[in-house]
Amino acid sequence: SNNKRAPYWTNTEKMEKRLHAVPAANTVKFRCPAGGNPMPTMRWLKNGKEFKQEHRIGGYKVRNQHWSLIMESVVPSDKGNYTCVVENEYGSINHTYHLDVVERSPHRPILQAGLPANASTVVGGDVEFVCKVYSDAQPHIQWIKHVEKNGSKYGPDGLPYLKVLKAAGVNTTDKEIEVLYIRNVTFEDAGEYTCLAGNSIGISFHSAWLTVLPAPGREKEITASPDYLE
């Protein structure tokens, strides 16, 4: 198209995480997806100065088509602020990431005590479970519901029946995955919910229970229904 346009960000979600704490020897990737007309160019600064290949052992890679900077096998000297500058003749935009290279002993994920917490709500209500995860290594987080099949919580092998409700994916941010929302709750939603966090060292998980109460004024109707009788 002939519509001239200054640079703009095309995927701000991928840029939300500004602080990257990465274990030594791992690969770091910073992205600044952008658009504009004419197509902007991208350059990178480290601590406000031009970032040159010779500034780090092994150099770095720039993937212009992915608007990314890649540094392999990071070391403590790679710590600092990395700024992408995206510009064309109509303007310039920039975004800064902070890289911290972690050298302490990485551990299996640590989950904040007391989370998720047991919750109760009435039928038709909303509830949320929160899980706070601390991990040196990049964690993968899942929310799991313990379900019943044929009236049983456990299979013939003695293992629990589980259903993955939510898992971190390409389009899911860390913040989004730490909260499980259940809208318009039904009696079937009652039960045990587990927040599971894993990394390359191991898996940790905490569970909480959801209690579902009858909606006020519906007691008679519920008592009359055989589905809810003990």
């Epitope: 791992n26 002993s105 299996r108 990049q138 993968h140 990394n199 390359s200 060292i201 191991g202 940790s204």
Partner: antibody, heavy 124, light 112 residues
């Protein structure tokens, strides 16, 4: 049957390189972290390195850091250990070990399956 | 690094008698999820280690119930209630909380 099969061991001179491989079968390799553990002749067990299920995280023992590189090819169900600047003290049986998976652990979350090991001898 | 110290170095047991191996960690292995991440292995001659006990006290599938694990935080014990000839081997404890993962020095169990 869940299996890990190491290969690539042999006799090598100090300062030279060697590449070990581990072929995995019987489980979804791409869903598990993988480790290397070694055992010097007549000695105990020493953890060497780990790589996350997708290869994005790697950790090494101080004794091999900067010399060894762990990698994986999920399309081929293969784990590798590139060993450079080998030393006499690297002489050991190297075991490939399955680590933590990505789902709910119905039992131990890793370190349950070991390969038979491959012998690496560093000698002049 | 977490140091795992195992005692005794070796153990000679009469078949049918109990055996006990101790392991001490330099830091607590009780994790935030309430589990204690100590694992026990046996390594028989010419074989790789085999998992016996995980998360302090859980027997791995196929492991006879004469094996049991116990302890808390930094002090752990593997017990064999009645030793059999096939139990000969070197026993190792391992911490599975953080890297570097570390093992005890091993306890050699032999039959009298």
């Amino acid at each position: 049957e869940v299996q890990l099969l190491e290969s690539g061991g042999g006799v090598v001179q100090p300062g030279r390189s060697l590449r070990l491989s581990c072929a995995a079968s019987g489980f979804t390799f791409s869903s598990y972290a993988m480790h290397w553990v070694r055992q010097a002749p007549g000695k105990g067990l020493e953890w060497v390195a780990v790589i996350s299920y997708d290869g994005s995280n790697k950790y090494y023992a101080d004794s091999v850091k900067g010399r060894f590189t762990i990698s994986r090819d999920n399309s081929k169900n293969t784990l590798s250990l590139q060993m450079n600047s080998l030393r006499v003290e690297d002489t050991a049986i190297y075991y490939c070990v399955r680590g933590a998976g990505r789902g709910y652990p119905y039992g131990p979350d890793g370190f349950d399956i070991w390969g038979q090991g491959t012998m690496v001898t560093v000698s002049s | 690094d977490i140091v795992m110290t195992q005692t005794p170095l070796s153990l000679s047991v009469t078949p049918g008698q109990p055996a006990s191996i101790s392991c001490t960690s330099s830091r607590s292995l009780l994790h935030s999820d309430g589990k204690t991440y100590v694992y026990w292995y046996v390594q028989k001659s010419g074989q790789p280690p085999q998992l016996l006990i995980y998360e302090l006290s859980n027997r791995f599938s196929g492991v006879p119930d004469r094996f049991s694990g116990s302890g808390s935080r930094t002090d752990f014990t593997l017990k064999i209630s009645r030793v059999e000839a096939e139990d000969v081997g070197v026993y190792y404890c391992m911490q599975y909380v953080e890297v570097p993962l570390t093992f005890g020095g091993g306890t050699k169990v032999e039959i009298k």
